[in-house]
Amino acid sequence: MKVLQEPTCVSDYMSISTCEWKMNGPTNCSTELRLLYQLVFLLSEAHTCIPENNGGAGCVCHLLMDDVVSADNYTLDLWAGQQLLWKGSFKPSEHVKPRAPGNLTVHTNVSDTLLLTWSNPYPPDNYLYNHLTYAVNIWSENDPADFRIYNVTYLEPSLRIAASTLKSGISYRARVRAWAQCYNTTWSEWSPSTKWHNSYREPFEQH
């Protein structure tokens, strides 16, 4: 049994880091493998993660962490029984994938303005809380070409757009994702999408 693709890990910079790897053949990850991880700290102890299958030869493990600070570094040991298959390390702050925003809501009752709001996925005491920026994706269910991205570079988790920038009388969907420049993170997953019917009063034409 050998590791074909070494574990790569990303952290949500809160409580979970996810490591993925591939074996050289079909593997029952949960019965055959264990990933041991330990914070490099005098008084820490090793924790065991039981991996799950992620495709035939792929495995994924969700490492639980109390919290994360920038200095944290973890040692990782991948075991098959008594055999050490791979040894490595992981610094969560250097491999951050933020949590996805939640509770995306479209408020359509604000005088021809669409107000999109969502929730910051982090509690206020987490470092990322004040460092997230967002991308909002809006698309038409009827017209695949009607697809747009709005970059929200301020901290407030909301976006206002004129309803008239979208076509009237058709349904749209929106979703939002986050990233943090401070840690050069990857983008989060998209939030679940929300749907609304776009309708607004056309202004009277001037003759």
């Epitope: 700290f41 005098l42 008084l43 102890e45 600070v69």
Partner: antibody, heavy 116, light 111 residues
Framework: EVQLLESGGGLVQPGGSLRLSCAAS????????MAWVRQAPGKGLEWVSA????????YYADSVKGRFTISRDNSKNTLYLQMNSLRAEDTAVYYC?????????WGQGTLVTVSS | QSVLTQPPSASGTPGQRVTISCSGS????????FNWYQQLPGTAPKLLIY???HRPSGVPDRFSGSKSGTSASLAISGLRSEDEADYYC???????????LGGGTKLTVLG
């Protein structure tokens, strides 16, 4: 609410022994390393000993090595410090502290006086 | 003799910004993070800053920490009379397998 309550302090003669206890509540005791820190009257803080969450890792300051023994009973949520061959310079308030990278919660301390 | 050196005293007037330093000796290992503790008169110490610059919940943002090599500093802005206390720095010394603490700095708020 995290609470740490030390007990077992008192007056002891040089060469004598004392056992300190620290009762923990308000958190999952078995998931945290613990430590003892002391403060002699009018002096600064001095780390004494620390123990990992399972008790497998144990560390001591040079000044107490071979005389003091730290231990824990996770089923009773209690930390202990067995102090033998006590000296006058061990006189101090002894604080129990929870470890999360640093000493993030402290007890109110128990006074140990070593005097003849 | 402490491995971490702090000034024995510091002072400032209300509203001022005060900085307390904590220096490791030249041979002090550069690996560990610094922590800061506040001890108000007659009370147990309280964690103020951990992992160089992180504040536990409940600690006002007037308190901030930074690290440079084997030294660290604690800054207190908008000084208040209730900040009068002893302040200690500490770090895990992996070469000694021990926790080392500075000698403490007594902060006096004048006026």
């Amino acid at each position: 609410e995290v609470q740490l309550l030390e007990s077992g302090g008192g007056l002891v003669q040089p060469g004598g022994s004392l056992r300190l206890s620290c009762a923990a509540s308000g958190f999952t005791f078995s998931r945290h390393a613990m430590a003892w820190v002391r403060q002699a009257p009018g002096k600064g803080l001095e780390w004494v000993s620390a123990i990992t969450m399972s008790g497998r890792g144990i560390y001591y300051a040079d000044s107490v090595k071979g005389r003091f023994t730290i231990s824990r009973d996770n089923s009773k949520n209690t930390l202990y410090l067995q102090m033998n061959s006590l000296r006058a310079e061990d006189t101090a308030v002894y604080y129990c502290a929870r470890v999360h990278r640093a000493f993030d919660y402290w007890g109110q301390g128990t006074l140990v006086t070593v005097s003849s | 003799q402490s491995v971490l050196t702090q000034p024995p005293s510091a002072s400032g007037t209300p509203g001022q910004r005060v900085t307390i330093s904590c220096s490791g000796s030249p041979l002090f290992p550069d690996s560990g993070s610094f922590n800061w503790y506040q001890q108000l008169p007659g009370t147990a110490p309280k964690l103020l800053i951990y992992a160089d610059s992180h504040r536990p919940s409940g600690v006002p943002d007037r308190f901030s920490g930074s690290k440079s090599g084997t030294s660290a500093s604690l800054a207190i802005s908008g000084l208040r009379s209730e900040d009068e206390a002893d302040y200690y720095c500490g770090t895990w010394d992996y070469s000694l397998s021990a926790y080392v603490l500075g000698g403490g700095t007594k902060l006096t708020v004048l006026g």
